[in-house]
Interface confidence: medium
Amino acid sequence: AIVLEEERYDLVEGQTLTVKCPFNIMKYANSQKAWQRLPDGKEPLTLVVTQRPFTRPSEVHMGKFTLKHDPSEAMLQVQMTDLQVTDSGLYRCVIYHPPNDPVVLFHPVRLVVTKGSSDVFTPVIIPITRLTERPILITTKYSPSDTTTTRSLPKPTAVVSSPGLGVTIINGTDADSVSTSS
């Protein structure tokens, strides 16, 4: 089995993590998607799943988890709000079709939540290619009065890319319109 490299993200309690997972629209338009946690040495724990009919755009809320599914954009967005230290762990976006093994959409996310200071970054993972289906990380400065990463990211925005992508910087306000050509 292929072992996927992890992407590590460090956040502070109270913040919101937003992950955008691209998927192959031709293969998975009519498939159920899910956000899973991978406890050490245990079976994956499915936290939230999309609902039928899977071809529809949808928003599913389950506690601190929100799954936004937009088939027309070939995108699954996951939000985890009000992060706590106990949320630290390994997570992944998958195509969910039990009893078969799930199909992992891209690299698992290693989330590390600390009590930390307020001078930290809030990450939003934005895919820039559907060929590799690897995410890039956009981080924005966090202030105590704003504990949520919003769609319109403030400037300046630093970009930390996955190895090999060759991306250096993206204007934060354009982050949601990064093209994902097939």
């Epitope: 009919p53 071809t55 529809r56 755009p57 949808s58 599913v60 809320h61 088939p71």
Partner: antibody, heavy 124, light 107 residues
Framework: QVQLQESGPGLVKPSQTLSLTCTVS??????????WSWIRQHPGKGLEWIGY???????YYNPSLKSRVTISVDTSKNQFSLKLSSVTAADTAVYYC????????????????WGQGTLVTVSS | DIQMTQSPSSLSASVGDRVTITCRAS??????LNWYQQKPGKAPKLLIY???SLQSGVPSRFSGSGSGTDFTLTISSLQPEDFATYYC?????????FGGGTKVEIK
């Protein structure tokens, strides 16, 4: 309490376009987890689902009507609309707008709120 | 499209009777089935969702069961206000489809 109200002409001439609007009150059309549908019922017959629109503008139309149907949404007015082109007498029906709900904890979509329906007659 | 077949298309019953209506899907739809009641000149009203869950405000004499392809709506003790037409509807796949309806009339 969510309420839906259909409005539009009750008489349409053959070959013309049927246009109806559904006004939603008591709730926002922009809320995620809801699909805004049109359903029709021919006189004395069963229910036929026409299609839905999501607040983002995404639509799905019943393949049997797809070539003639357009559903649009105006979130600022909390309304969504139906246009059915090239109508014939076979399109004479009561047209309902309804909310298709997939709220958390409900394992299936279901039409939980309906308009009262409006009869549209296609005749010259 | 998934075809939904209801039976019977009509039935006559008396107040107090136990009434059963069946709905069959042309392929498995798990529990993605809803039941509606419609009275003349009115919009349909949701009774049961997810095959067996009672919609808020609906009397407990209504119940639903089944999964896969075969489903049942049961009225344990028919009341005068229950004389109406009942429809099943699947939400497993788009396009959404309804059964042809079952008209419950007074005997």
């Amino acid at each position: 309490q969510v309420q839906l109200q259909e409005s539009g002409p009750g008489l349409v001439k053959p070959s013309q376009t049927l246009s109806l609007t559904c006004t939603v009150s008591g709730g926002s059309i922009s809320s995620g987890g809801y699909y805004w549908s049109w359903i029709r019922q021919h006189p004395g017959k069963g229910l036929e689902w026409i299609g839905y629109i999501y607040y983002s503008g995404s639509t799905y139309y019943n393949p049997s009507l797809k070539s003639r149907v357009t559903i649009s949404v105006d979130t600022s007015k909390n309304q969504f609309s139906l246009k059915l082109s090239s109508v014939t007498a076979a399109d004479t029906a009561v047209y309902y707008c309804a909310r298709d709900s997939s709220i958390a904890g409900r394992a299936t979509l279901s039409f939980d709120y309906w308009g009262q329906g409006t009869l549209v007659t296609v005749s010259s | 499209d998934i075809q939904m077949t209801q039976s019977p298309s009509s039935l006559s019953a008396s107040v107090g009777d136990r009434v059963t209506i069946t709905c069959r899907a042309s392929q498995s739809i798990s529990s993605y089935l809803n039941w509606y009641q419609q009275k003349p000149g009115k919009a349909p009203k949701l009774l049961i969702y997810a095959a067996s869950s009672l919609q808020s405000g609906v009397p407990s004499r209504f119940s639903g069961s089944g999964s896969g392809t075969d489903f049942t709506l049961t009225i344990s003790s028919l009341q005068p206000e229950d004389f109406a037409t009942y429809y099943c509807q699947q939400s497993f796949y788009d396009p959404i489809t309804f059964g042809g309806g079952t008209k419950v009339e007074i005997k």
